[in-house]
Amino acid sequence: QPDAINAPVTCCYNFTNRKISVQRLASYRRITSSKCPKEAVIFKTIVAKEICADPKQKWVQDSMDHLDKQTQTPKT
């Protein structure tokens, strides 16, 4: 059984067709196609809901950039 020791990688089979406001997003993670049927981005919202999104869509890329900048900026 391959990767039996590791936790299974969650996968996405469909993508949301609605743009999510960045104010609702807390974090994201990328899913690669070698482990799953589709390359995907999984956004976690501020209420801890996880949503699959298409990494090819511009709003998804913009949201990831926004979250990256948020993480890099120290909160004072």
């Epitope: 299974p8 996968c11 089979y13 899913i31 999984i42 996880e50 999104a53």
Partner: nanobody, 125 residues
Framework: EVQLVESGGGLVQAGGSLRLSCAAS????????MGWFRQAPEKEREFVAA????????YYADSVKGRFTISRDNARNTVYLQMNSLKPEDTAVYYC??????????????????WGQGTQVTVSS
């Protein structure tokens, strides 16, 4: 607990065909995706194909599109991988795996957590 048993592997010449079977037991599979993965010596395990049990939607890795076909038989709780135009680079251990789907269409799944023991496919040139 989901149990998966693969069969149908073997030795075949390049250009030939094989059909792998994966018999599933121990659960209700309507909320599952069933997938095939492969692992060649010294390489990472890679996704090959998947089918959503409920609706029958299929997904393929680019490397097998047009050559491999995944299907399922609900009555037999079995998933098949028909492999045509086999190439030496398809040589690997092929694993069947089950993935519990999320509660909604856009929610991530639990991940491929249940695995079969694997079946060896060797394609000679």
């Amino acid at each position: 607990e989901v149990q998966l048993v693969e069969s149908g592997g073997g030795l075949v010449q390049a250009g030939g065909s094989l059909r792998l079977s994966c018999a599933a037991s121990g659960g209700t599979f309507s909320n599952y995706a069933m997938g095939w993965f492969r692992q060649a010596p010294e390489k990472e395990r890679e996704f090959v194909a998947a089918v959503i049990w409920r609706g029958g939607s299929t997904y393929y890795a680019d490397s097998v599109k047009g050559r491999f076909t995944i299907s399922r038989d609900n009555a037999r709780n079995t998933v098949y991988l028909q492999m045509n135009s086999l190439k030496p680079e398809d040589t690997a251990v092929y694993y069947c795996a089950a993935d519990l789907l999320g509660n909604s269409d856009y929610e991530p799944s639990s991940g491929f957590g249940s695995w079969g023991q694997g079946t060896q496919v060797t394609v000679s040139s």
